[in-house]
């Protein structure tokens, strides 16, 4: 799976979309999880309604919401009041019983609020040394991760 980068501004909301084959994943619940380390597990953040037919209802876990357009085949995750600690690698998943299919790998980047003059040193920009000039940008907030880019911050 390629990784798609979604950028959001600190303090604002970020909407992440994950398209999928609606027929293949018909009847299956979806989830949003956070990757713990490069080879670590993906920790569930929020999943769609237990009753699949009600997947269109928005479900919240803290500041993260999930809703599923099962006909159109688009899973949408909303991260409200984006914070620097929200930056990192996530996955949209389709649940196959207790197993999960990865629908999309997502790298969330948190940009400093241009109106906020506090120290931006805490903000993490994965692969910030790389050139993003050739990257594909969707809706000006997402793009595919370039080959060779590091989706996790280097550990010192």
């Amino acid at each position: 799976h390629n990784t798609t980068v979604f950028q959001g501004v600190a303090g604002q909301s970020l909407q992440v979309s994950c398209p999928y084959d609606s027929m293949k994943h018909w009847g299956r619940r979806k989830a949003w999880c956070r990757q713990l380390g490069e080879k670590g597990p993906c920790q569930r953040v929020v999943s769609t309604h237990n009753l699949w037919l009600l997947s269109f209802l928005r479900r919240w876990n803290g500041s993260t919401a999930i809703t599923d357009d099962t006909l159109g085949g688009t899973l949408t995750i909303t991260l409200r009041n984006l914070q620097p600690h929200d930056a990192g690698l996530y996955q949209c998943q389709s649940l196959h019983g207790s197993e999960a299919d990865t629908l999309r790998k997502v790298l969330v980047e948190v940009l400093a609020d241009p109106l906020d003059h506090r120290d931006a040193g805490d903000l993490w920009f994965p692969g910030e040394s790389e050139s993003f000039e050739d990257a594909h940008v969707e809706h000006s907030i997402s793009r595919s991760l370039l080959e060779g880019e590091i989706p996790f911050p280097p550990t010192s």
């Epitope: 027929m23 293949k24 018909w26 009847g27 237990n50 009753l51 699949w52 099962t70 019983g97």
Partner: antibody, heavy 122, light 108 residues
Framework: EVQLVQSGAEVKKPGESLKISCKGS????????IGWVRQMPGKGLEWMGI????????RYSPSFQGQVTISADKSISTAYLQWSSLKASDTAMYYC???????????????WGQGTMVTVSS | EIVLTQSPGTLSLSPGERATLSCRAS???????LAWYQQKPGQAPRLLIY???SRATGIPDRFSGSGSGTDFTLTISRLEPEDFAVYYC?????????FGGGTKVEIK
């Protein structure tokens, strides 16, 4: 009419290979997962695995992983179950079945093949 | 894997009587992912109930399903001669999906 038609009964010797088939008709074959279920003589149903003919994505029950291979040829709307080396304990009725999908927004098996009896004996 | 235990193993009843079949799961199962099947001798299984309580197309309303969590029930309100068969429950909430051992409903 939506239906799954399976290949005929087979009598094989231990160690031989076998591939049985399940042909779908009356619906878009690539749009529903197809599963395989084993029923040993006088016993209950066992879920073996499933395949999505649209892209051949496959899932196996741990009990059958490595014992059988599930495949599909979407160009002829057919799913397959195969063994490379049969054992006497593989003697059973094998059913293919369609996951309901769009019909029910559900993952239950709504359409079943008539079954293929496989007998393995020396 | 989730183990489904069906009881009783055999149910001996007369036509016109009410049949109550139980399916108990070793751990909680979402009601969205619990199904019931009927199998007659020499035939393939047939889907009766999906989502624990919804009847499949063409299934008479004398068949009904209920339950949640770990306890599910299939009820046949008035047994017809063609209802004498083996009934299986199945969960597909957890991998791998599993079937119960079956309940045989036989003529008393």
């Amino acid at each position: 009419e939506v239906q799954l038609v399976q290949s005929g009964a087979e009598v094989k010797k231990p160690g031989e290979s076998l591939k049985i088939s399940c042909k779908g008709s009356g619906y878009s074959f690539t749009s529903n997962w197809i599963g395989w279920v084993r029923q040993m003589p006088g016993k209950g149903l066992e879920w073996m695995g499933i395949i999505y003919p649209g892209d051949s994505d496959t899932r196996y029950s741990p009990s059958f992983q490595g014992q059988v291979t599930i495949s599909a040829d979407k160009s002829i709307s057919t799913a397959y179950l195969q063994w490379s080396s049969l054992k006497a304990s593989d003697t059973a009725m094998y059913y293919c079945a369609r996951e309901a999908g769009y019909d029910y927004g559900e993952l239950a098996f709504d359409i079943w093949g008539q079954g293929t009896m496989v007998t393995v004996s020396s | 894997e989730i183990v489904l235990t069906q009881s009783p193993g055999t149910l001996s009843l007369s036509p016109g009587e009410r049949a109550t079949l139980s399916c108990r799961a070793s751990q909680s199962v979402s009601s969205s992912y619990l199904a019931w099947y009927q199998q007659k001798p020499g035939q393939a299984p047939r889907l009766l109930i999906y989502g624990a309580s919804s009847r499949a197309t063409g299934i008479p309303d004398r068949f009904s399903g209920s339950g949640s969590g770990t306890d599910f029930t299939l009820t046949i309100s008035r047994l017809e001669p063609e209802d004498f068969a083996v009934y299986y429950c199945q969960q597909h909430d957890s991998s791998p999906p599993t079937f119960g051992g079956g309940t045989k409903v036989e003529i008393k």
